[in-house]
Interface confidence: medium
């Protein structure tokens, strides 16, 4: 009896050893076994002329097989797919003349430290190479010259200070490239070359924004579309490009991609990818938020910087999960620093606090006229929360400023809350509006949805108006939506939304800004527990009579965006913030962040 | 030519045993995967075992535990030893070459009936 | 198990003019790896063995006649006779060699009119 599993699938042999604490190579292992996998055993080292007999060997699976060490002293003309992840190499040998048929080799999550020059020569056939969560520091130079046919290549979470130039030259079938969260700071010019590449994954790295980033800023700018945050768990086919996610760690985490580059010396070379001059100037502006609590004793001041906008409002939202968990009753502040992304929760116990997030954004009225024009979005019966929208248009010629209402409707059986994020959108002369967001959200931990009031004011004089949104998320897990509108409706037996009271639009922006600096560094995570002993009902009559307030002086945009997480939506926006004061990290700080 | 000549085959009381035999020639038999198939009287084709070069056998769930199929190179010949007979394995069984790995039958014997019936 | 259905069952035919049977799988027979589908096609003539006659749906095995012909990829699969002959008649079977246990189709019937 074998001590592996066999059966054939695909007209080639396949034996499972998997998790059958092997020390070493079965004995009896059928000499025409095509796919092998040896995961989850306890081998130690391998040496590649263990299984030089294997002649139709083509899948080799060794990952979590407490590897120190790899031997190719034999070869393996068939295999095309090896997989060593999670174990604890600490180096590769050189590859290529054992198994000259390779075509995916996967060394992810291992202990490398250094990759020897020649590791990949004679793997002309690789097309996936994956080296993510190691502990590479640098690459040598010529690394990939042998793997032309290269399609997929992963580097993410790994320490790369730096890139060599020619890194990718000559893979002209590269299409997926991983670069996210390392310690990169600046991308070697002319590093991309001519190659289009499709999915590139560039954020939580430590670009710094200085002269030498334009052509990257460049870049970027030609390749918005293709640059994406990762997602654990989703395809990135499923995913939004995210060009606002490579930020600077030098400037308030600001885009790489609106880095204005003012003062940096022209060079002829740099004329084609590097032209900052034709850039408009974009006026100053400010929106402040504030974010206090009903103790009374902690306040954080906080400024907002506009960032870039983007056709839809959720297509630069970023899914972060929760750093954080707390096991008692209490706040946590997660401070985002830069350089290194570093996060450092620091908590502070408290009695059950309910926030109110407010937007202090003055503003010059503007004319306004209603559209009678209303937009709804059918939400899966009894499943997801209603979508409403109301948005607000600011004609040329418009005379008379109207509030708008706005209603947030729910499936009378829905057990998945409704976050809302209300939006203040008012164009700008120049009819490209700047979206800023706050996010306020509430994490799963608390048994019931605690409410979150906004007050929505106007901006200080300008002529140029910022737009804001603030999003008020709920937890995942809560039975109760909480209301955050002027207006709560739930259908008795419609699963149809209710149309909003007015829908308003906005003018269509008519360019692409490039130039606008923001910032994302700070977020606000806000775990609220409430007493056990409160019934829902006293805590709904108690606290939600302050819902979600639109000022009738207010011309805004309110959209109601289902979530079906807890994640925080941060979309490319600044919430920044230093803590100054000796107290506590909730009391005051304020600032002014202007655009260049 | 390559050549497959099936014998063994006879009638057998249910709960009973009997052993095959397939005489291979005309080509390099240890090279070869080698199968057999079935065909119950009137009825289709019905795959009951294979056996790789190597040695390593497969069976479907229905003759699983009951039939082993074996190979000796040396003599050229493949062998299903079927034990715990049923009616339903009442067939003529066939000898069959297997085309390298990808388990298509490019050559078959004549066949040899086996009959089980109280 | 891949369950493998032909049709028609039974398909008389006029010498000279063509034929076609088709057999489609539960699921699919690519292989991704090399784009091949694998299914097979055999004739068993009246009280003879079963013959191959085409391999990765369309591979003509050997001294089969080209007026045979394969094609089809995925679930659904055809196999053409471009002018039937009078020997051509038998019951004729399909077979995924994709997955084991290797199955075959309940088979067609193809006789002279």
């Known amino acids: 009896q074998h001590t592996c599993s066999i059966s054939k699938v695909t007209s080639l042999l396949e034996v499972n050893c998997e998790n059958k604490k092997l020390t070493a190579l079965p004995a009896d292992l059928p000499a025409d076994t095509g796919i092998l996998h040896l995961g989850e055993n306890q081998l130690g080292t391998f040496s590649t002329a263990s299984l030089v007999h294997f002649t139709h060997l083509t899948y080799l699976y060794l990952d979590r097989c407490e590897l120190t060490s790899l031997q190719t002293n034999g070869k393996l003309i068939k295999l095309e797919n090896l997989d060593l992840s999670h174990n604890n190499l600490k180096s590769l040998p050189s590859l290529g003349w054992a198994l000259p048929a390779l075509t995916t080799l996967d060394v992810s999550f291992n202990k490398l430290g250094s990759l020897s020059p020649g590791v990949l020569d004679g793997l002309s056939q690789l097309q996936e190479l994956y080296l993510q969560n190691n502990d590479l520091k640098s690459l040598p130079p010529g690394l990939l010259l042998p793997t032309t046919k290269l399609k997929k290549l992963n580097l993410a979470n790994n320490k790369l200070r730096e890139l060599p130039s020619g890194l990718l030259d000559g893979l002209e079938d590269l299409d997926t490239l991983y670069l996210q969260r390392n310690w990169l700071r600046t991308i070697p010019k002319g590093f991309f070359g001519t190659l289009l590449l499709p999915f590139v994954f560039l954020h939580a790295n430590s670009w710094y924004c200085d002269c030498e980033i334009l052509y990257f800023r460049h870049w970027l700018q030609e390749n918005a579309n293709n640059v994406y945050l990762w997602k654990q768990g989703v395809d990135v086919k499923d995913t939004t490009p995210n060009v606002a996610s490579v930020r600077c760690a030098n400037l308030d985490n600001a885009p790489v991609y609106s880095y204005p580059g003012k003062g940096c010396p022209t060079s002829s070379g740099d004329t084609d990818y590097d032209d900052y001059d034709d850039i408009p100037d974009v006026p100053a502006t400010r929106t402040e938020v504030k974010f206090s609590t009903n103790t009374k004793v902690h306040t954080t001041h906080w400024s907002l910087l506009a960032a870039a906008p983007s056709t839809s409002q959720d297509s630069q939202m970023i899914s972060l999960p929760p750093t954080h968990k707390p096991t008692k009753k209490q706040s946590t502040f997660i401070h985002t620093q830069s350089p290194g992304f570093t996060t450092l929760p620091e908590t502070m116990e408290s009695n059950p606090t309910f926030y109110s997030l407010k937007l202090n954004t003055v503003l010059i009225p503007s004319p306004t006229t209603l559209e009678p024009t209303s937009t709804q979005a059918t939400p899966e019966p009894n499943i997801q929360p209603m979508l409403t929208t109301s948005t607000l248009t600011t004609p040329e010629h418009s005379t008379t400023p109207v509030p708008t209402t706005t209603i947030l409707t729910t499936p009378e059986h829905s057990t998945i809350p409704v976050p809302t994020t209300a939006i203040l959108t008012t164009p700008k002369p120049s009819t490209i509006p700047v979206p800023t967001t706050a996010t306020l959200t509430t994490l799963e931990p608390s048994t019931t949805p605690v409410p979150t009031t906004a007050t929505l004011t106007t901006p200080e004089p300008s002529t140029t108006l910022v737009p804001t949104t603030a999003t008020l998320t709920t937890p995942e897990h809560s039975t109760t939506p909480v209301p955050t509108t002027a207006t709560l409706t739930t259908p008795e037996h419609s699963t149809t939304p209710v149309p909003t009271t007015a829908t308003l639009t906005t003018p269509e922006p008519s360019t692409t800004l490039t130039n606008l600096v923001s910032t994302i560094s700070p977020v606000l995570t806000t775990t609220l527990t409430t007493p056990e002993s409160t019934p829902i009902e006293t805590i709904l009559e108690q606290f939600f009579t302050t819902e979600l307030t639109l000022l009738p002086t207010l011309e805004s945009t309110t959209t109601i965006i289902p979530e079906q997480n807890s994640f925080l939506n941060l979309p490319e926006v600044a919430l920044v913030s230093s803590d100054t004061s000796e107290s506590s990290p909730f009391l005051n700080s304020d600032f002014c962040c202007f655009l260049p | 030519q390559v050549q497959l000549v099936e014998s063994g085959g006879g009638l057998v009381k249910p709960g009973g045993s009997l052993r095959l035999s397939c005489a291979a020639s005309?080509?390099?038999?240890?090279?070869?995967?080698m199968s057999w198939i079935r065909q119950a009287p009137g009825k289709g084709l019905e795959w009951v075992s294979s056996?790789?070069?190597?040695?390593?056998?497969y069976y479907p769930d229905s003759v699983l535990g009951r039939f082993t199929i074996s190979r000796d190179n040396a003599k050229n010949s493949l062998y299903l030893q079927m034990n715990s007979l049923r009616a339903e394995d009442t067939a003529v069984y066939y000898c069959?070459?297997?085309?390298?790995?990808?388990?298509?039958?490019?050559?078959w014997g004549q066949g040899t009936l086996v009959t089980v019936s109280s | 198990d891949i369950v493998m259905t032909q049709s028609p069952l039974s398909l008389p035919v006029t010498p000279g003019e063509p034929a076609s049977i088709s057999c489609k799988s539960s699921?699919?027979?690519?292989?991704?790896?090399?784009?091949?589908?694998?299914l097979a096609w055999y004739l068993q003539k009246p009280g003879q063995s079963p013959q191959l006659l085409i391999y990765?749906?369309?591979t003509r095995e050997s001294g089969v006649p080209d007026r045979f012909s394969g094609s089809g990829s995925g679930t659904d699969f055809t196999l053409k006779i471009s002018r039937v002959e009078a020997e051509d008649v038998g019951v004729y079977y399909c077979?995924?060699?994709?997955?084991?246990?290797?199955?075959f189709g309940q088979g067609t019937k193809v006789e002279i009119k």
């Open positions: 069959a070459r297997s085309r390298g790995y990808e388990d298509y039958f490019d050559y």
């Open positions: 005309g080509f390099t038999f240890s090279s070869f995967a």
């Open positions: 056996i790789t070069s190597a040695g390593t056998p």
């Open positions: 699921q699919s027979l690519l292989n991704s790896r090399n784009q091949k589908n694998y």
């Open positions: 990765f749906t369309s």
């Open positions: 077979q995924q060699h994709y997955s084991s246990p290797w199955t």
